[in-house]
């Protein structure tokens, strides 16, 4: 077969080929940020000629053109400056309202390198309607100026701009406009991952946050947890495998879907995942009718087995058939469960379509969506039961209109996106499911995105201050209790001056709480073994503080999961009959378990907890500490089995002021406290300039560094005695 010519350079840009110079290969141009390629792509035809998709005239030279943002077409009840036909990247537009009108939205907006305006649509509103003035986004024209109950407004975009969002919206009885805000965008524009992740995440969190299954009921026979079975989600992942998707991109589609699956299973809801790859025909790799669809490992392994070559005989893009296979799956499940049953009607459905282009065969995908809406009986009351996310990747042949038509339209949410490349998609899926936005006391959730603050990463972390100076750290284990070390409290029982500083989204300094009561382990006595030549002994170094008020859960304040509790069991996705021993076997399951603690400056530092025979050799070093233990004969007199041991190899050592802080591990995107910092043989902060300075121990140091942490699995009776009404403990 003839190959296509190689004189396809783009001045100022680069290109990639999906299948070399052979027929069927897609050539994709890219330009530096702030520029866009024209044309965006070319396809090598079987005749050995390049064809530009959608082009009517002969092949023109590819160039990088400057990105521009659309100008306002009309702005009601106010003025905007400067008045230009379109705006360059970095250019601003400012809005002011006439007297009697209040500006809602952004007074100044800047044109971003992706051809999208930052901020929100500016609206001059006098609050007269039943619904607020819906405004007119930049580049749009609106018809309809009455905002009473039942009134409709319609939107279209000027010139060659593409409308995403709702072209028609209705003022509903609750004072909210139906659908989603329309945005007019350049055909070449795309979304930045940092915008998509929160938008997608917000929408997803709405759906997931509605179904937290832990609910306590008090009964005369003690307490019992009820798992609400009503919260079930069917997630359908549709992965485009057509010719224009390169094998490498398909791998990233798969990886992104795996991330999504991993995250979704970390939520405490019941979920079934379907996986469908498609080109000319769909291939169902996992159906929600299969019991394995509820098992994360099974779902991920079916994703891993998805093969790019499965579709090599039919390389078109049949989005209709892919969506129709979702419809057929729903139909089968409805017949199985019974159309009128709660079991069927209470399932929420989310479809995520990952594609790189427009459908080019099989009919309109919109028809399949209509069938899906019909079978799920989606109306205003049941709008929450279906979410369709249409994500275009590659900004070349992606059809904005089609994506927009497929994506759900919900107030304040976006469901249709175009990303620049698969790398951006991966970033989005990494950050979209930020459970830390949930306001209930779901435990062990930290924001893991790159731009999160230290406190958002470890929102359970608190600082304890006796007076003005900070002295110890601790961890929120509920909305009112903090777990810390007993040795922090050596001033008798007067804790009236003490404060606990908890993370707060409104202040970088956090929020201070008084202590209602301090429960210090009665077994703790640092001088208990003084007559044996053990000058300091840290057995039972554990304390609980009850705060004077409840902490409001937020991105900056949230409890960590305590093992051996029902809350941790849900987070670990373990079966209901699990025991404390099962948790210990799952969390401390190796000779060397990677774990973390939080430094004085808030950053997360790494250690390795030594178990089994490695615990013994880790603890042995204590015999070399002659000041604290002048005539020690048995190391176990000092390092009892209450302690976890770290500090070997490249481990960080905690400073004294980090005592009481959580020693924690990450499992399934959730965090579990297995220990608390107690004592050690080396202080890396001693005499340092500030909280950011730590000194590594010299390699020759005798004894070498070792750190000991109270093992929470060994403190179960005490924890249960004091937290029995706060947490739901599993059998030992």
């Amino acid at each position: 077969a003839p190959s296509c010519p190689q004189n396809v350079n783009i001045s100022g840009g680069t290109f990639t080929l999906s299948h070399g110079w052979a027929p069927g290969s897609l050539l994709t141009y890219s330009c530096p940020q702030g520029l866009y390629p024209s044309p965006a792509s070319r396809l090598c035809k079987s005749s050995g000629q390049w064809q530009t998709p959608g082009a009517t005239r002969s092949l023109s030279k590819a160039v990088c053109k400057p990105v521009r943002c659309p100008a306002p077409v009309s702005f009601e009840n106010g003025i905007y400056t400067p008045r230009l036909g379109s705006y360059p990247v970095g250019g601003n537009v400012s809005f002011e309202c006439e007297d009697g009108f209040i500006l809602r939205g952004s007074p100044v907006r800047q044109c971003r390198p992706n051809g999208m305006w930052d901020g929100e649509t500016a609206v001059c509103d006098n609050g007269a309607g039943h619904c607020p003035n819906p405004g007119i986004s930049l580049g749009a024209v609106r018809t309809g100026f009455r905002f009473g109950h039942g009134d409709k407004v319609r939107y279209r975009c000027s010139s060659n701009l593409v409308l995403t969002g709702s072209s028609e919206r209705e003022c509903q009885g609750n004072g909210v406009w139906s659908g989603t805000e329309p945005i007019c965008r350049q055909p070449y524009s795309y979304d930045f991952p940092e915008d998509v992740a929160p938008a997608l995440g917000t929408s997803f969190s709405h759906m997931l946050g509605a179904t937290n299954p832990t609910q306590k009921t008090k009964e005369s026979l003690g307490r019992k947890i009820q798992i609400q079975r009503s919260g079930h989600l069917n997630l359908y992942l549709l992965l485009d495998c057509s010719q224009s998707v390169s094998e490498n991109d398909f791998l990233i589609f798969k990886e992104s879907a795996s991330l999504m699956v991993d995250r979704i299973f970390s939520f405490e809801i019941n979920v079934s995942v379907a996986i469908i790859t498609f080109a000319s025909e769909p291939k169902v790799l996992m159906s929600v009718l299969n019991d394995n669809s509820r098992d994360m490992t099974e779902v991920i392994s079916s994703l891993e087995n998805a093969n790019y070559k499965d579709h090599e005989n039919g390389t078109g893009t049949n989005t209709y058939a892919a969506l129709n296979s979702v419809y057929l799956m729903m139909n089968n499940q409805m017949r199985l469960l019974g159309m009128e049953t709660m079991a069927w009607q209470e399932i929420r459905h989310a479809i995520i379509l990952l594609t790189d282009g427009k459908s080019n065969m099989g009919g309109s995908p919109k028809t399949a969506v209509d069938h899906i809406r019909e079978i799920l009986n989606i109306n205003q009351k049941r709008n929450d039961y279906l979410d369709i996310y249409a994500i275009g990747v590659g900004k070349l042949d992606v059809d904005w209109r089609e994506l927009n038509e497929l994506g759900s339209k919900k107030d304040g949410e976006r469901h249709a996106f175009i990303l620049q490349d698969t790398k951006a998609l991966h970033q989005v899926f990494e950050h979209m499911l930020d459970v830390s936005k949930l306001t209930d006391t779901i435990c062990g959730v930290g924001n893991m995105s790159a731009n999160a603050s230290d406190q958002e990463r470890t929102p359970w972390h608190v600082t304890i201050k006796p007076k003005s100076q900070e002295t110890c750290r601790g961890a929120l284990i509920s909305d009112q209790w903090v777990l810390t070390a007993a040795h922090c409290f050596r001033d008798g029982n007067d804790h009236s001056l003490w404060r606990v500083n908890v993370g707060d989204p409104k202040s970088q300094w956090g929020k201070e709480f008084l202590i209602e009561k301090a429960v210090i382990s009665p077994g703790f006595d640092v001088f208990a073994k003084k007559n044996q030549g053990i000058l300091e002994f840290y057995g039972d170094d554990i304390a609980l503080l009850k705060l004077a008020q409840k902490v409001k859960m937020s991105t900056h304040a949230r409890p960590i999961c305590l093992p051996c509790t029902m809350e941790a069991n849900l987070a670990l996705r373990r079966p209901q009959g699990s025991t404390c021993r099962d948790h210990e076997n799952e969390l401390l399951n190796k000779q060397s378990v990677p774990a973390h603690f939080v430094a004085l400056n808030g950053s997360k530092l790494n250690i390795n907890l030594k178990m089994g025979v490695e615990w013994t050799s880790c603890a042995e070093v204590v015999s070399q500490e002659k000041t604290m233990f002048p005539n020690l004969t048995d190391v176990r007199e000092v390092v009892t089995d209450q302690f976890l041991c770290s500090g070997t190899q490249e481990d960080e050592s905690p400073c004294k002021g980090e005592s009481g802080g959580a020693v924690f591990l990450e499992r399934r995107f959730r965090f579990f406290q297995v220990g608390l910092v107690s004592w050690g043989l080396y202080n890396p902060c001693l005499g340092s300039a500030d909280k950011n300075s730590r000194k590594r121990a010299p390699r020759s140091k005798v004894p070498p560094p070792r750190d000991f942490h109270i093992n929470l699995f060994r403190m179960q009776p005490w924890l249960r005695q004091h937290l029995g009404d706060v947490l739901n403990f599993l059998p030992l």
């Epitope: 006796p466 007076k467 003005s468 100076q469 900070e470 002295t471 110890c472 050596r490 001033d491 640092v526 001088f527 000058l535 300091e536 004085l600 000041t627 604290m628 400073c655 004294k656 002021g657 005592s659 202080n683 902060c685 001693l686 005499g687 340092s688 300039a689 500030d690 909280k691």
Partner: nanobody
Framework: QVQLVESGGGLVQPGGSLRLSCSAS????????MGWFRQAPGKEREFVAS????????EYADSVKGRFTISRDNSKNTLYLQMNSLRAEDTAAYYC???????????????WGQGTLVTVSS
């Protein structure tokens, strides 16, 4: 907060000894880690030694290890620094410090004495 007053400084020949004392007011002395810092003319303040609130563990800067000994008497609310084999480079103002956490971060310390001068010279 603990009020601290150092004493015992003076002029001493190289190889000689001195004992510094630091007297603390306030009944909470026994719950504080205590430490000594020093500052030579034109230099930064540096850590010398510390002792835990129990008296059970001590830490020293490498430059003084084996020559200086820190101790405390909780019944007298007093901290000591026994300095032997003194060298010219030990010449500095010596400060006593109290710290509840035991890290003695210079940026956070709020209990300092006014210092006592030690001059090592022949």
């Amino acid at each position: 907060q603990v009020q601290l007053v150092e004493s015992g400084g003076g002029l001493v020949q190289p190889g000689g000894s001195l004992r510094l004392s630091c007297s603390a007011s306030g009944h909470t002395f026994r719950s504080y880690y205590m430490g000594w810092f020093r500052q030579a003319p034109g230099k930064e303040r540096e850590f010398v030694a510390s002792i835990s609130w129990t008296g059970g563990s001590t830490e020293y800067a490498d430059s003084v290890k084996g020559r200086f000994t820190i101790s405390r008497d909780n019944s007298k609310n007093t901290l000591y620094l026994q300095m032997n084999s003194l060298r010219a480079e030990d010449t500095a103002a010596y400060y006593c410090a109290a710290d509840y956490s035991g890290d003695f971060l210079l940026s956070d310390l709020d209990s300092w004495g006014q210092g006592t001068l030690v001059t090592v010279s022949s």
